[in-house]
């Protein structure tokens, strides 16, 4: 049994780090492998993560952790029974992938404006709470040529779009993702998308 692609891990800077790797051949990850992790810290214990399959040769493990601080450093050992397949380390604060924003809602009852709101995925006491900026992707299933990214660089999780910039009488979808500039994170996954119908019509005298 051999590791083809070494484990790569990212942290949500809250309570979970996710490690993914590829094996040299088809593997029943949960039956054959264990990922052991231990914080480099006085009197810490070794904890075990049971991986899941992620495609035929891929494995993924969700490591449960305490809150993340910049000093945290983990040793990682990938075992197949009594055989050590790989040994490495992981510093969560240096490999952050934020959680995806949630509760994306479209408000169309505001005159002339489409208002999109969503929730910050972190509690106020988390360091990322006040550091997230967002990208909102809006596209149309009726008009495949239409897809826009709106960068939201302010803290408030809202975006206002003049309804007149969207075509009337067709449906649109939106999704949102986040990143934290000061933590040099990757982008989060996209939130689930939400759909709405743009029924806005310009006033008669403007046509």
């Amino acid at each position: 049994m051999k590791v083809l692609q070494e484990p790569a891990c990212v942290s949500d800077y809250m309570s979970i780090s996710t490690c993914e790797w590829k094996m040299g051949g088809p593997t029943n990850c949960s039956a054959e492998l264990r990922l052991l992790y231990q914080l480099v810290f006085q009197s810490s214990e070794t904890h075990t993560c049971v991986p899941e399959n992620n495609g035929g040769v891929g494995c993924v493990c969700h490591l449960l952790m305490d809150d993340v601080v910049s000093m945290d450093n983990y040793t990682l050992d990938l075992w197949a029974g009594q055989q050590l397949l790989w040994k490495g380390s992981f510093k969560p604060s240096e490999h952050v992938k934020p959680r995806a924003p949630g509760n994306l809602t479209v408000h169309t009852n505001v005159s002339d404006t489409v208002l999109l709101t969503w929730s910050n995925p972190y509690p106020p006491d988390n360091y990322l709470y006040n550091d997230l900026t967002y990208a909102v992707n809006i596209w149309s299933e009726n008009d495949p040529a239409y897809s826009r990214i709106h960068n939201v660089t302010y803290l408030k999780p809202t975006l206002r779009i003049p309804a007149s910039t969207l075509k009337s009488g067709i449906s649109y979808r939106a999704r949102v993702r986040a990143w934290a500039q000061h933590y040099n994170t990757t982008w989060s996954e996209w939130s689930p998308s939400t759909k709405w119908y743009n029924s806005y019509r310009e006033p008669f005298e403007q046509r």
Epitope: Q42, S43, S44, E45, H47, M65, D66, V69, S70, M71
Partner: antibody, heavy 125, light 112 residues
Framework: EVQLVESGGGLEQPGGSLRLSCAGS????????MTWVRQAPGKGLEWVSS????????YYADSVKGRFTISRDNSKNTLYLQMNSLRAEDTAVYYC??????????????????WGQGTTVTVSS | DIVMTQSPLSLPVTPGEPASISCRSS???????????VDWYLQKSGQSPQLLIY???KRASGVPDRFSGSGSGTDFTLKISRVEAEDVGFYYC?????????FGQGTKLEIK
């Protein structure tokens, strides 16, 4: 009531051995790291050794490394310090103390919040 | 190893007056914000040490509020707002960030 009671001290000749015990009660013994601290006559406190809750991680002062062994039996709620190749400078009162909660991924520290009454070890010919 | 240096080593105090003991570590014992791995212990004559302050500034259960801890990084202070006769004994600071745990030399507090 959370309590630690040491035993096993006594008079031993240089080069001899002693085994100290520390019985814990009133808390979930296996969840906590444990520590031994000693105090030579008229001197200050000196850390000797620590062990994680499961016993998988052990730590020693340079002055005792290779001679002393810390261990624990969580089924008996008891901590041990096996002392071999004793020297005159090991003469001290030995205290066991309850250390950090080590079952969490990052052990939670509340100080050495419970101490035993101490057991006296005298090494002399 | 982290060296802990206490001062003063002897502290005569009048009852009711404040007292202050300093402890300096040879390297930072700050792990993360609010987590300075420094404790303060009091050892009264003929007794086991007892915990007063942990993580730099957190008062242990049952410790009177006249005791307080402060500081961060490498410089720490134990303050007693109004010394009482029962406070006499040796005070030790200790770092527990990493083994070997190390203690200060001890400060003897006595009543004038």
């Amino acid at each position: 009531e959370v309590q630690l009671v040491e035993s096993g001290g006594g008079l031993e000749q240089p080069g001899g051995s002693l085994r100290l015990s520390c019985a814990g009660s009133g808390f979930t013994f296996r969840d906590f790291a444990m520590t031994w601290v000693r105090q030579a006559p008229g001197k200050g406190l000196e850390w000797v050794s620590s062990i994680s809750g499961s016993g998988s991680s052990t730590y020693y002062a340079d002055s005792v490394k290779g001679r002393f062994t810390i261990s624990r039996d969580n089924s008996k709620n008891t901590l041990y310090l096996q002392m071999n190749s004793l020297r005159a400078e090991d003469t001290a009162v030995y205290y066991c103390a309850k250390d950090r909660l080590s079952v969490t991924v990052r052990p939670r520290y509340y100080g050495l919040d419970v101490w035993g009454q101490g057991t006296t070890v005298t090494v002399s010919s | 190893d982290i060296v802990m240096t206490q001062s003063p080593l002897s502290l005569p105090v009048t009852p009711g007056e404040p007292a202050s003991i300093s402890c300096r570590s040879s390297q930072s014992v700050l792990y993360s914000i609010g987590y300075n791995y420094v404790d303060w212990y009091l050892q009264k004559s003929g007794q086991s040490p007892q915990l007063l302050i942990y993580l730099g500034n957190k008062r242990a259960s049952g410790v009177p509020d006249r005791f307080s801890g402060s500081g961060s990084g490498t410089d720490f202070t134990l303050k007693i707002s109004r010394v009482e006769a029962e406070d006499v004994g040796f005070y030790y600071c200790m770092q527990s960030l990493t083994s070997p745990y190390t203690f200060g030399q001890g400060t003897k507090l006595e009543i004038k």
